[in-house]
């Protein structure tokens, strides 16, 4: 059974993940991003279901494509450092989903833009955090 300290740790990790995802979204989803139009042409796989921490497997599998798209945004105005950011996210995701059980991710039929993809995982984090608090 989860202890209060493990719940608190999970909550903090989710908040960190949420902040990272929001910062990425904030960095790209605005009119000042010169590469936004191009970035929106890339397609991401969305989870069929995302209600538990194990479903973060679906996010983990899309981190490499995410990094590649974020590399497009590099300019004097964008300080995302995709490699560092994705590496941080990867570490958090691995800790949160655990490595004991192997979960096969199921994807929805429809693909999504980077903005829809990030918003979906932001909503996931907010939803899990709200159940923990």
């Amino acid at each position: 059974a989860p202890t209060s300290s493990s719940t608190k740790k999970t909550q903090l990790q989710l908040e960190h993940l949420l902040l990272d995802l929001q910062m990425i979204l904030n960095g790209i989803n605005n009119y000042k991003n010169p590469k936004l139009t191009r970035m929106l042409t890339f397609k991401f796989y969305m989870p069929k279901k995302a209600t538990e921490l194990k479903h973060l497997q679906c996010l983990e599998e899309e981190l490499k494509p995410l990094e590649e798209v974020l590399n497009l945004a590099q300019s004097k105005n964008f300080h995302l450092r995709p490699r560092d950011l994705i590496s941080n996210i990867n570490v958090i995701v691995l800790e949160l989903k655990g490595s004991e059980t192997t979960f096969m991710c199921e994807y929805a039929d429809e693909t999504a833009t980077i903005v829809e993809f990030l918003n979906r995982w932001i909503t996931f984090c907010q939803s899990i955090i709200s159940t923990l608090t």
Partner: antibody, heavy 126, light 111 residues
């Protein structure tokens, strides 16, 4: 001093078109992004569209996408909003507002929405 | 879209007394460039909006120092230290971290 003057508003029937203009003076128009914002009678503010300093990138609110077109003529220091397929819910005062400043290498800085025009009223009614 | 929620809807204040308006964002507004693009606008009756505060707490040129902004992340506040007659109007928070969105507005009126 910075001045933005909108024109082109009026009464128009649903389904018809209208073109708004915003004449800018007192600053280097070609170095700034520009926005259109609207305000329905007695309501709050709603962002409509933005255009980059060079006119290359344009973005729209979902409510006007596919119907409205933002453009600019830097030689005339003028911003435009072409409004097609107008609906009753487009009735509002339309404001132009100045966006971020871009330097010669495309680096942006400065405040968005720092100067606004007086607005022009568009009424869509049969 | 980022949703901006303002409270209160209306704020009746006595001349010379302080006033405070809150604004909450549905998303953290910290941009990857390190700035938080949260602004406050004032709209006097029959007038266009006017920029008061940008990037949470920076007063725009010509704005009296009785206006101040504070906050971080998702929660922001505009304070008027001593309300004057010319401060009557509607105040809007807005974010330009992503595509611009505005709060619903707070009407400041004299009691």
């Amino acid at each position: 001093q910075v001045q933005l003057v909108e024109s082109g508003g009026g009464v128009v029937q649903p389904g018809r078109s209208l073109r708004l203009s915003c004449a800018a003076s007192g600053f280097t128009f070609s170095s700034y992004a520009m926005h259109w914002v609207r305000q329905a009678p007695g309501k709050g503010l709603e962002w409509v569209a933005v255009i980059w300093y060079d006119g290359i990138n344009k973005y729209y609110a979902d409510s006007v996408k596919g119907r409205f077109t933002i453009s600019r003529d830097n030689s005339k220091n003028t911003l435009y909003l072409q409004m097609n397929s107008l609906r009753a819910e487009d009735t509002a005062v339309y404001y132009c507002a100045r966006g971020s400043y871009y330097d010669s290498s495309g680096y942006y800085f400065g405040e968005d929405f720092d100067y606004w025009g007086q607005g022009t009223l568009v009424t869509v009614s049969s | 879209d980022i949703v901006m929620t303002q409270t209160p809807l209306s704020s009746p204040v006595t001349l010379g007394q302080p006033a405070s308006i809150s604004c909450r964002s549905s998303h953290n507004l910290l941009h990857s460039d390190g700035n938080t693009y949260l602004s406050w606008l004032q709209q006097r009756p029959g007038q266009p909006p006017r920029l008061l505060i940008y990037e949470i707490s920076n007063r725009f040129s010509g704005v009296p120092d009785r206006f101040s902004g504070s906050g971080a992340g998702t929660d922001f506040t505009l304070k008027i230290s001593r309300v004057e007659a010319e401060d009557v109007g509607v105040y809007y928070c807005m974010q330009v971290t992503q595509f611009p969105t505005f709060g619903g507005g707070t009407k400041v009126e004299i009691k």
